[in-house]
């Protein structure tokens, strides 16, 4: 349920508040509905970046569990396949404020959308 | 910065449809935001009405869903509301928005047109 | 019935501190966004997030969340922030938009 990672995306964020995490992540700001499964797979493989940036045991297990609920929303909508999208490594780098911001923004895409 | 401007009738007689378009001027209806309506009877409360992403996704207020259109249009930066079967209880401000990037909120908002519903 | 609850009313004496509160169980998992609208005004957003102001808007708005419930905080109010005050998150499904009741806010 996309909702549930909105709840863990949540947590993440009132979590990381009191840290200083300099990372910077790849980040899809604008993504093309046709590529939103490719954009969510980059989001939660940056996504464990913070949790290895911030060495903290609450928010390694939110992580983890956003990510286990994530895959599992994206296999229950098939095995689908997408062509012509940007590799993570192509996206441009974020601090984690707009990292965050944009990974709300495309768990909404698939709520919306669905 | 971002401008939205509503337009369209006033005044809609009962059981017909109001029509309304919102011009964004200042920024494009193709970025990455949603966009919405939300309207406001007067004396009362705001009430979100539908929303429309520039690919042509819609979701709308499943208290109005079966009355109500949402679309697009990129080539004149615009998009529109229609409210059919309308009655005394549609007359309200208008309000055409946009949502920001992420967390649920509006960041622009047109300044609202008043629509009566009246014979 | 609105999935967000405000008090209807609230009020402040000048130079205060007032907090407005918005409740529903979907804010256990979405931020809530606050507005202030006055008489014959389109919404202005105040707060968004979990604490961000928009550029313009004054130190003295803050927000939090806690559970189920969102609060307003203004500290140090002033004449002008007598309002209305609506809250505005998403609902349950996630697909839907939906307002507070608005609290209208007297400033003594």
């Known amino acids: 349920n996309w909702v549930n990672v909105i709840s863990d995306l949540k947590k993440i964020e009132d979590l990381i508040q009191s840290m200083h995490i300099d990372a910077t992540l790849y980040t899809e700001s604008d993504v093309h509905p046709s590529c939103k499964v490719t954009a969510m797979k980059c989001f939660l493989l940056e996504l464990q970046v913070i949790s290895l940036e911030s060495g903290d045991a609450s928010i390694h297990d939110t992580v983890e569990n956003l990510i286990i609920l994530a895959n599992n929303s994206l296999s229950s909508n098939g095995n689908v396949t997408e062509s012509g999208c940007k590799e993570c490594e192509e996206l441009e780098e974020k601090n984690i404020k707009e990292f965050l911001q944009s990974f709300v923004h495309i768990v909404q895409m698939f709520i919306n959308t669905s | 910065q971002v401008q939205l401007q509503e337009s369209g009738p006033g005044l809609v007689k009962p059981s017909g449809t109001l029509s309304l378009t919102c011009a964004v001027s200042?920024?494009?209806?193709?970025?990455?935001?949603?966009w919405s309506w939300v309207r406001q009877p007067p004396g009362k409360g705001l009430e979100w009405i539908g929303e429309?992403?520039?690919?042509?996704?819609?979701n709308y207020n499943p208290s109005l869903k079966s009355r109500v259109t949402i679309s697009v249009d990129k080539s004149k930066n615009q998009f529109s509301l229609k409210l059919s079967s309308v009655t005394a209880a549609d007359t309200a401000v208008y309000y055409c928005a946009r949502e920001g990037i992420g967390w649920p909120s509006f960041d622009y908002w047109g300044q609202g047109t008043l629509v009566t519903v009246s014979s | 019935s609105s999935e967000l609850t405000q008090d209807p009313a609230a009020s402040v004496a000048l130079g205060q501190t007032v907090r407005i509160t918005c409740q529903g169980d979907t804010l256990r998992s979405y931020y809530a966004s606050w507005y202030q609208q006055k008489p014959g005004q389109a919404p202005i957003l105040v707060i968004y997030g979990k604490n961000n102001r928009p550029s313009g808007i004054p130190d003295r708005f803050s927000g939090s969340s806690s559970g189920n419930t969102a609060s307003l905080t203004i500290t140090g109010a002033q004449a002008e922030d007598e309002a209305d005050y609506y809250c505005?998150?998403?609902?349950?499904?996630?697909?839907?938009?939906?307002f507070g009741g608005g609290t209208k806010l007297t400033v003594l």
């Open positions: 429309i992403y520039h690919y042509g996704y819609t």
């Open positions: 200042g920024g494009s209806i193709s970025s990455s935001n949603w």
């Open positions: 505005n998150s998403r609902d349950l499904s996630g697909k839907n938009l939906v």
